[in-house]
Protein backbone atom coordinates (compact mmCIF):
# COMPACT_ATOMS: atom_id res chain seq x y z
CA UNK A 1 0.00 0.00 0.00
CA UNK A 2 1.46 3.36 -1.01
CA UNK A 3 1.57 5.96 1.76
CA UNK A 4 -0.65 8.96 1.02
CA UNK A 5 1.46 12.11 0.65
CA UNK A 6 0.66 15.47 -0.89
CA UNK A 7 1.49 15.83 -4.56
CA UNK A 8 4.65 17.94 -5.06
CA UNK A 9 4.11 21.33 -6.64
CA UNK A 10 3.86 21.20 -10.44
CA UNK A 11 3.55 17.41 -10.57
CA UNK A 12 -0.24 17.06 -10.67
CA UNK A 13 -1.09 15.00 -13.75
CA UNK A 14 -3.23 16.89 -16.28
CA UNK A 15 -3.29 13.88 -18.58
CA UNK A 16 -1.96 10.34 -18.74
CA UNK A 17 1.32 10.65 -20.61
CA UNK A 18 4.82 9.19 -20.72
CA UNK A 19 6.24 11.55 -18.13
CA UNK A 20 4.34 9.56 -15.48
CA UNK A 21 6.64 6.57 -15.91
CA UNK A 22 9.34 8.53 -14.07
CA UNK A 23 7.03 9.22 -11.11
CA UNK A 24 7.81 7.33 -7.95
CA UNK A 25 5.04 5.11 -6.61
CA UNK A 26 3.92 7.61 -3.98
CA UNK A 27 3.89 10.38 -6.60
CA UNK A 28 1.59 8.32 -8.83
CA UNK A 29 -0.70 7.77 -5.87
CA UNK A 30 -0.72 11.43 -4.92
CA UNK A 31 -0.66 13.11 -8.32
CA UNK A 32 -2.83 10.99 -10.61
CA UNK A 33 -6.57 11.43 -10.26
CA UNK A 34 -8.47 8.13 -10.48
CA UNK A 35 -11.22 9.63 -12.66
CA UNK A 36 -8.59 10.96 -15.08
CA UNK A 37 -7.00 7.53 -15.15
CA UNK A 38 -10.33 5.88 -15.91
CA UNK A 39 -11.14 8.21 -18.81
CA UNK A 40 -7.68 7.85 -20.34
CA UNK A 41 -7.11 4.11 -19.83
CA UNK A 42 -6.37 3.72 -23.52
CA UNK A 43 -3.14 5.66 -22.95
CA UNK A 44 -1.99 3.56 -19.99
CA UNK A 45 -1.15 0.51 -22.07
CA UNK A 46 0.95 2.61 -24.44
CA UNK A 47 3.19 3.57 -21.51
CA UNK A 48 5.53 0.77 -20.33
CA UNK A 49 4.85 1.16 -16.61
CA UNK A 50 6.57 -1.32 -14.32
CA UNK A 51 4.32 -3.81 -12.57
CA UNK A 52 5.04 -1.95 -9.31
CA UNK A 53 3.61 1.20 -10.87
CA UNK A 54 0.67 -0.74 -12.32
CA UNK A 55 -0.10 -1.92 -8.77
CA UNK A 56 -0.58 1.73 -7.78
CA UNK A 57 -2.82 2.42 -10.78
CA UNK A 58 -4.88 -0.70 -10.04
CA UNK A 59 -5.31 0.46 -6.44
CA UNK A 60 -6.67 3.78 -7.69
CA UNK A 61 -9.15 2.08 -10.03
CA UNK A 62 -10.23 -0.30 -7.25
CA UNK A 63 -11.03 2.66 -5.03
CA UNK A 64 -12.96 4.38 -7.82
CA UNK A 65 -14.91 1.24 -8.79
CA UNK A 66 -15.34 -0.95 -5.69
CA UNK A 67 -18.24 -2.82 -7.35
CA UNK A 68 -16.16 -3.66 -10.45
CA UNK A 69 -14.77 -1.79 -13.43
CA UNK A 70 -16.99 -0.59 -16.28
CA UNK A 71 -16.36 -2.14 -19.69
CA UNK A 72 -14.92 1.14 -21.02
CA UNK A 73 -12.05 0.68 -18.54
CA UNK A 74 -11.77 -3.11 -18.88
CA UNK A 75 -11.26 -2.94 -22.65
CA UNK A 76 -8.10 -0.86 -22.22
CA UNK A 77 -6.49 -2.63 -19.25
CA UNK A 78 -3.66 -4.14 -21.28
CA UNK A 79 -0.88 -5.34 -18.97
CA UNK A 80 -2.94 -4.21 -16.00
CA UNK A 81 -5.16 -7.25 -16.72
CA UNK A 82 -2.30 -9.47 -15.56
CA UNK A 83 -2.55 -7.81 -12.13
CA UNK A 84 -6.23 -8.70 -11.75
CA UNK A 85 -7.33 -11.57 -9.53
CA UNK A 86 -10.22 -13.89 -10.38
CA UNK A 87 -12.10 -12.15 -7.55
CA UNK A 88 -11.64 -8.80 -9.31
CA UNK A 89 -12.85 -10.24 -12.61
CA UNK A 90 -15.96 -11.82 -11.08
CA UNK A 91 -17.21 -8.28 -10.43
CA UNK A 92 -17.10 -7.41 -14.13
CA UNK A 93 -19.82 -7.53 -16.72
CA UNK A 94 -18.07 -8.09 -20.05
CA UNK A 95 -20.35 -8.21 -23.09
CA UNK A 96 -18.22 -6.90 -25.97
CA UNK A 97 -16.24 -9.40 -28.05
CA UNK A 98 -13.70 -6.64 -28.69
CA UNK A 99 -13.07 -6.39 -24.96
CA UNK A 100 -12.59 -10.14 -24.71
CA UNK A 101 -10.17 -10.15 -27.64
CA UNK A 102 -8.17 -7.25 -26.21
CA UNK A 103 -7.66 -9.05 -22.90
CA UNK A 104 -6.94 -12.46 -24.44
CA UNK A 105 -4.30 -10.74 -26.58
CA UNK A 106 -2.44 -9.72 -23.39
CA UNK A 107 -2.21 -13.38 -22.36
CA UNK A 108 -1.52 -14.69 -25.88
CA UNK A 109 0.99 -17.50 -26.17
CA UNK A 110 0.64 -18.55 -22.54
CA UNK A 111 -1.37 -21.19 -20.74
CA UNK A 112 -4.90 -20.28 -19.81
CA UNK A 113 -4.57 -18.56 -16.44
CA UNK A 114 -7.25 -18.57 -13.71
CA UNK A 115 -7.84 -14.92 -14.65
CA UNK A 116 -8.53 -15.80 -18.29
CA UNK A 117 -10.75 -18.74 -17.31
CA UNK A 118 -12.77 -16.44 -15.05
CA UNK A 119 -12.96 -13.78 -17.76
CA UNK A 120 -14.30 -16.28 -20.30
CA UNK A 121 -16.82 -17.56 -17.79
CA UNK A 122 -18.00 -14.01 -17.07
CA UNK A 123 -18.19 -13.23 -20.78
CA UNK A 124 -20.23 -16.31 -21.65
CA UNK A 125 -22.58 -15.68 -18.71
CA UNK A 126 -22.90 -12.04 -19.75
CA UNK A 127 -23.79 -12.99 -23.32
CA UNK A 128 -26.08 -15.76 -22.25
CA UNK A 129 -24.85 -18.13 -24.97
CA UNK A 130 -21.79 -19.43 -26.77
CA UNK A 131 -22.34 -18.00 -30.23
CA UNK A 132 -20.20 -18.73 -33.26
CA UNK A 133 -18.16 -15.51 -33.01
CA UNK A 134 -17.35 -16.18 -29.36
CA UNK A 135 -16.29 -19.75 -30.08
CA UNK A 136 -14.21 -18.65 -33.05
CA UNK A 137 -12.40 -16.20 -30.79
CA UNK A 138 -11.88 -18.63 -27.92
CA UNK A 139 -10.69 -21.52 -30.08
CA UNK A 140 -8.34 -19.18 -31.95
CA UNK A 141 -6.64 -18.16 -28.70
CA UNK A 142 -7.10 -21.45 -26.83
CA UNK A 143 -7.80 -24.47 -29.04
CA UNK A 144 -7.68 -26.61 -25.87
CA UNK A 145 -10.70 -24.71 -24.64
CA UNK A 146 -12.85 -27.09 -26.71
CA UNK A 147 -12.35 -29.90 -24.19
CA UNK A 148 -13.71 -27.76 -21.38
CA UNK A 149 -17.05 -27.41 -23.16
CA UNK A 150 -19.99 -29.76 -22.75
CA UNK A 151 -21.12 -31.83 -25.77
CA UNK A 152 -24.13 -29.51 -26.00
CA UNK A 153 -21.91 -26.44 -26.16
CA UNK A 154 -19.61 -28.16 -28.65
CA UNK A 155 -22.48 -28.73 -31.04
CA UNK A 156 -22.35 -25.04 -31.96
CA UNK A 157 -18.61 -25.05 -32.72
CA UNK A 158 -18.12 -24.20 -36.41
CA UNK A 159 -16.03 -26.71 -38.41
CA UNK A 160 -13.74 -23.85 -39.46
CA UNK A 161 -12.51 -23.60 -35.84
CA UNK A 162 -11.26 -27.19 -36.00
CA UNK A 163 -8.32 -26.12 -38.19
CA UNK A 164 -6.70 -24.39 -35.20
CA UNK A 165 -6.79 -27.53 -33.04
CA UNK A 166 -3.49 -29.25 -32.27
CA UNK A 167 -3.36 -32.94 -31.21
CA UNK A 168 -2.38 -32.04 -27.63
CA UNK A 169 -5.40 -29.77 -27.35
CA UNK A 170 -7.66 -32.84 -27.44
CA UNK A 171 -5.80 -34.75 -24.73
CA UNK A 172 -8.41 -33.92 -22.10
CA UNK A 173 -11.45 -34.53 -24.31
CA UNK A 174 -13.62 -37.48 -23.32
CA UNK A 175 -15.37 -39.79 -25.83
CA UNK A 176 -18.64 -37.86 -25.63
CA UNK A 177 -16.85 -34.70 -26.69
CA UNK A 178 -14.99 -36.46 -29.50
CA UNK A 179 -18.30 -37.87 -30.74
CA UNK A 180 -19.35 -34.27 -31.38
CA UNK A 181 -16.00 -33.01 -32.68
CA UNK A 182 -15.22 -35.87 -35.07
CA UNK A 183 -17.98 -35.13 -37.63
CA UNK A 184 -16.93 -31.48 -37.61
CA UNK A 185 -13.30 -32.43 -38.23
CA UNK A 186 -14.36 -34.79 -41.01
CA UNK A 187 -16.24 -31.93 -42.63
CA UNK A 188 -13.39 -29.45 -42.10
CA UNK A 189 -10.75 -31.74 -43.67
CA UNK A 190 -12.90 -33.36 -46.36
CA UNK A 191 -11.03 -31.78 -49.27
CA UNK A 192 -7.60 -33.06 -48.23
CA UNK A 193 -5.94 -36.03 -49.86
CA UNK A 194 -5.54 -39.41 -48.13
CA UNK A 195 -2.30 -39.11 -46.18
CA UNK A 196 -2.77 -35.44 -45.29
CA UNK A 197 -6.35 -36.12 -44.25
CA UNK A 198 -5.25 -38.90 -41.91
CA UNK A 199 -2.64 -36.70 -40.23
CA UNK A 200 -5.29 -34.08 -39.48
CA UNK A 201 -8.18 -36.40 -38.56
CA UNK A 202 -6.08 -38.76 -36.40
CA UNK A 203 -6.54 -36.79 -33.16
CA UNK A 204 -10.33 -36.84 -33.59
CA UNK A 205 -10.72 -40.56 -34.34
CA UNK A 206 -11.90 -41.29 -30.81
CA UNK A 207 -15.27 -40.18 -32.15
CA UNK A 208 -15.18 -42.14 -35.42
CA UNK A 209 -17.87 -44.76 -36.26
CA UNK A 210 -17.11 -48.25 -37.57
CA UNK A 211 -17.81 -47.42 -41.22
CA UNK A 212 -15.20 -44.65 -41.20
CA UNK A 213 -12.60 -46.97 -39.65
CA UNK A 214 -13.38 -49.54 -42.33
CA UNK A 215 -12.88 -46.87 -45.00
CA UNK A 216 -9.55 -45.83 -43.46
CA UNK A 217 -8.39 -49.46 -43.47
CA UNK A 218 -8.52 -49.36 -47.26
CA UNK A 219 -6.15 -46.37 -47.44
CA UNK A 220 -2.83 -47.71 -46.07
CA UNK A 221 -2.85 -45.23 -43.20
CA UNK A 222 -0.70 -47.25 -40.73
CA UNK A 223 -2.47 -46.08 -37.60
CA UNK A 224 -0.28 -46.19 -34.50
CA UNK A 225 -1.33 -48.19 -31.44
CA UNK A 226 -1.79 -45.08 -29.28
CA UNK A 227 -4.47 -43.84 -31.68
CA UNK A 228 -6.04 -47.30 -31.98
CA UNK A 229 -6.34 -47.60 -28.19
CA UNK A 230 -8.34 -44.34 -28.08
CA UNK A 231 -10.94 -45.56 -30.58
CA UNK A 232 -14.48 -46.21 -29.42
CA UNK A 233 -14.82 -49.85 -28.36
CA UNK A 234 -18.21 -50.11 -30.08
CA UNK A 235 -16.62 -48.84 -33.31
CA UNK A 236 -13.72 -51.34 -33.15
CA UNK A 237 -15.70 -54.49 -32.30
CA UNK A 238 -17.28 -55.01 -35.77
CA UNK A 239 -13.90 -54.72 -37.55
CA UNK A 240 -12.56 -57.93 -39.03
CA UNK A 241 -9.03 -59.18 -38.40
CA UNK A 242 -8.14 -58.31 -41.98
CA UNK A 243 -9.48 -54.75 -41.55
CA UNK A 244 -7.53 -54.19 -38.33
CA UNK A 245 -4.42 -55.55 -39.99
CA UNK A 246 -4.81 -53.11 -42.88
CA UNK A 247 -5.66 -50.25 -40.53
CA UNK A 248 -2.57 -50.71 -38.37
CA UNK A 249 -0.16 -51.83 -41.10
CA UNK A 250 3.28 -52.46 -39.54
CA UNK A 251 1.92 -51.40 -36.13
CA UNK A 252 -0.27 -54.51 -35.94
CA UNK A 253 2.47 -56.23 -33.90
CA UNK A 254 1.65 -53.87 -31.05
CA UNK A 255 -1.67 -55.64 -30.48
CA UNK A 256 0.10 -58.35 -28.47
CA UNK A 257 1.25 -55.87 -25.82
CA UNK A 258 -2.28 -54.48 -25.56
CA UNK A 259 -4.26 -57.74 -25.65
CA UNK A 260 -5.48 -57.32 -22.06
CA UNK A 261 -6.62 -53.73 -22.54
CA UNK A 262 -9.70 -52.21 -24.14
CA UNK A 263 -10.58 -52.02 -26.96
CA UNK A 264 -8.15 -54.78 -28.04
CA UNK A 265 -9.32 -57.23 -25.37
CA UNK A 266 -12.98 -56.87 -26.32
CA UNK A 267 -12.18 -57.03 -30.02
CA UNK A 268 -10.21 -60.29 -29.59
CA UNK A 269 -13.20 -61.87 -27.83
CA UNK A 270 -15.30 -61.15 -30.93
CA UNK A 271 -12.89 -62.68 -33.47
CA UNK A 272 -12.54 -66.28 -34.58
CA UNK A 273 -9.34 -67.76 -33.15
CA UNK A 274 -8.49 -69.05 -36.64
CA UNK A 275 -8.52 -65.48 -37.96
CA UNK A 276 -6.43 -64.18 -35.06
CA UNK A 277 -3.87 -66.92 -35.68
CA UNK A 278 -3.29 -65.59 -39.19
CA UNK A 279 -1.66 -62.53 -37.63
CA UNK A 280 1.05 -64.75 -36.12
CA UNK A 281 1.12 -62.70 -32.92
CA UNK A 282 -0.03 -65.37 -30.49
CA UNK A 283 -3.22 -63.52 -29.62
CA UNK A 284 -5.47 -65.76 -27.48
CA UNK A 285 -9.10 -65.53 -26.40
CA UNK A 286 -10.86 -65.64 -29.74
CA UNK A 287 -13.92 -67.74 -30.53
CA UNK A 288 -12.80 -71.39 -30.80
CA UNK A 289 -13.16 -73.12 -34.13
CA UNK A 290 -16.54 -74.78 -34.71
CA UNK A 291 -18.42 -72.44 -32.37
CA UNK A 292 -21.46 -70.57 -33.64
CA UNK A 293 -21.66 -66.83 -32.87
CA UNK A 294 -25.11 -65.57 -31.98
CA UNK A 295 -25.78 -61.87 -32.08
CA UNK A 296 -28.00 -61.59 -29.00
CA UNK A 297 -28.78 -57.97 -29.61
CA UNK A 298 -30.30 -58.96 -32.95
CA UNK A 299 -32.30 -61.76 -31.27
CA UNK A 300 -33.70 -59.32 -28.71
CA UNK A 301 -34.75 -56.94 -31.47
CA UNK A 302 -36.69 -59.73 -33.22
CA UNK A 303 -38.50 -60.99 -30.10
Amino acid sequence: EVEKTACPSGKKAREIDESLIFYKKWELEACVDAALLATQMDRVNAIPFTYEQLDVLKHKLDELYPQGYPESVIQHLGYLFLKMSPEDIRKWNVTSLETLKALLEVNKGHEMSPQVATLIDRFVKGRGQLDKDTLDTLTAFYPGYLCSLSPEELSSVPPSSIWAVRPQDLDTCDPRQLDVLYPKARLAFQNMNGSEYFVKIQSFLGGAPTEDLKALSQQNVSMDLATFMKLRTDAVLPLTVAEVQKLLGPHVEGLKAEERHRPVRDWILRQRQDDLDTLGLGLQGGIPNGYLVLDLSMQEALS
Epitope: P48, T50, Y51, E52, L54, Y79, L82, K83, V106, G109, H110
Partner: nanobody, 117 residues
Protein backbone atom coordinates in the same frame (compact mmCIF):
# COMPACT_ATOMS: atom_id res chain seq x y z
CA UNK B 1 11.54 -16.64 -14.30
CA UNK B 2 14.20 -14.22 -15.54
CA UNK B 3 17.58 -13.76 -13.87
CA UNK B 4 19.48 -10.48 -14.17
CA UNK B 5 23.13 -9.70 -13.44
CA UNK B 6 24.47 -6.14 -13.56
CA UNK B 7 28.12 -5.25 -14.09
CA UNK B 8 30.31 -2.27 -15.00
CA UNK B 9 30.00 -0.23 -11.82
CA UNK B 10 32.98 1.27 -10.03
CA UNK B 11 34.72 4.44 -8.90
CA UNK B 12 34.96 7.26 -11.43
CA UNK B 13 35.94 10.92 -11.28
CA UNK B 14 33.40 13.69 -11.95
CA UNK B 15 33.09 14.26 -15.69
CA UNK B 16 34.08 10.64 -16.38
CA UNK B 17 32.16 7.86 -18.11
CA UNK B 18 30.99 4.34 -17.32
CA UNK B 19 29.05 1.73 -19.21
CA UNK B 20 26.79 -0.55 -17.20
CA UNK B 21 25.61 -3.90 -18.51
CA UNK B 22 22.75 -6.12 -17.44
CA UNK B 23 22.75 -9.71 -18.69
CA UNK B 24 19.40 -11.50 -18.70
CA UNK B 25 18.93 -15.27 -18.63
CA UNK B 26 16.04 -17.68 -18.17
CA UNK B 27 12.77 -17.03 -20.00
CA UNK B 28 14.15 -14.06 -21.92
CA UNK B 29 11.68 -14.47 -24.79
CA UNK B 30 8.96 -13.12 -22.49
CA UNK B 31 10.82 -9.88 -21.71
CA UNK B 32 8.92 -6.81 -22.82
CA UNK B 33 10.47 -3.71 -21.28
CA UNK B 34 13.87 -3.31 -19.59
CA UNK B 35 14.65 -0.60 -17.03
CA UNK B 36 17.55 1.02 -15.20
CA UNK B 37 16.82 2.36 -11.71
CA UNK B 38 19.12 3.81 -9.10
CA UNK B 39 19.11 4.32 -5.36
CA UNK B 40 21.41 6.90 -3.84
CA UNK B 41 22.47 6.57 -0.18
CA UNK B 42 19.58 7.61 2.08
CA UNK B 43 17.23 8.26 -0.83
CA UNK B 44 14.40 6.34 -2.46
CA UNK B 45 14.82 4.37 -5.63
CA UNK B 46 14.12 6.20 -8.90
CA UNK B 47 13.69 5.15 -12.52
CA UNK B 48 16.54 6.35 -14.71
CA UNK B 49 15.72 4.96 -18.15
CA UNK B 50 13.80 2.28 -20.03
CA UNK B 51 13.71 0.62 -23.42
CA UNK B 52 10.82 -1.44 -24.81
CA UNK B 53 10.98 -4.56 -26.98
CA UNK B 54 10.05 -2.34 -29.93
CA UNK B 55 13.06 -0.13 -29.28
CA UNK B 56 11.25 2.87 -27.79
CA UNK B 57 13.36 4.41 -25.06
CA UNK B 58 13.46 7.36 -22.73
CA UNK B 59 15.60 8.71 -19.90
CA UNK B 60 14.74 10.78 -16.83
CA UNK B 61 15.11 14.57 -17.04
CA UNK B 62 17.91 14.49 -14.45
CA UNK B 63 20.18 12.49 -16.78
CA UNK B 64 18.96 13.68 -20.19
CA UNK B 65 21.82 14.42 -22.56
CA UNK B 66 24.26 12.48 -20.41
CA UNK B 67 22.90 8.92 -20.16
CA UNK B 68 21.88 6.63 -23.02
CA UNK B 69 20.03 3.33 -22.71
CA UNK B 70 20.25 0.52 -25.28
CA UNK B 71 19.62 -3.19 -25.53
CA UNK B 72 21.03 -6.00 -27.61
CA UNK B 73 18.27 -8.58 -27.99
CA UNK B 74 20.59 -11.13 -29.57
CA UNK B 75 22.74 -11.07 -26.41
CA UNK B 76 19.82 -10.49 -24.02
CA UNK B 77 21.76 -7.59 -22.58
CA UNK B 78 20.77 -4.10 -21.47
CA UNK B 79 23.25 -1.21 -21.37
CA UNK B 80 23.46 2.20 -19.76
CA UNK B 81 26.09 4.53 -21.16
CA UNK B 82 26.80 7.21 -18.55
CA UNK B 83 28.79 10.29 -19.57
CA UNK B 84 29.63 13.56 -17.78
CA UNK B 85 29.11 11.87 -14.42
CA UNK B 86 28.42 13.98 -11.36
CA UNK B 87 28.70 13.35 -7.64
CA UNK B 88 24.90 13.18 -7.41
CA UNK B 89 24.93 10.19 -9.79
CA UNK B 90 26.51 8.12 -7.02
CA UNK B 91 24.11 5.25 -6.34
CA UNK B 92 23.48 1.56 -6.63
CA UNK B 93 22.17 0.99 -10.16
CA UNK B 94 19.63 -1.78 -10.68
CA UNK B 95 18.24 -3.28 -13.82
CA UNK B 96 14.73 -4.73 -13.92
CA UNK B 97 12.47 -6.24 -16.56
CA UNK B 98 8.77 -6.52 -17.23
CA UNK B 99 7.69 -9.78 -18.85
CA UNK B 100 4.53 -10.73 -20.70
CA UNK B 101 4.07 -13.92 -18.72
CA UNK B 102 4.15 -13.03 -15.05
CA UNK B 103 2.93 -9.81 -13.42
CA UNK B 104 5.97 -9.01 -11.29
CA UNK B 105 9.14 -7.07 -12.03
CA UNK B 106 12.32 -9.12 -12.03
CA UNK B 107 15.36 -7.42 -10.51
CA UNK B 108 19.10 -7.75 -10.53
CA UNK B 109 21.25 -7.40 -7.39
CA UNK B 110 22.62 -4.00 -8.40
CA UNK B 111 26.04 -2.51 -9.18
CA UNK B 112 27.56 0.39 -7.25
CA UNK B 113 28.62 3.54 -9.08
CA UNK B 114 30.67 6.03 -7.08
CA UNK B 115 31.50 9.44 -8.57
CA UNK B 116 34.17 11.11 -6.52
CA UNK B 117 37.44 12.93 -6.94
Amino acid sequence: EVQLVESGGGLVQPGGSLRLSCAASGRTSTIDTMYWHRQAPGKERELVAYVTSRGTSNVADSVKGRFTISRDNSKNTLYLQMNSLRAEDTAVYYCSVRTTSYPVDFWGQGTLVTVSS
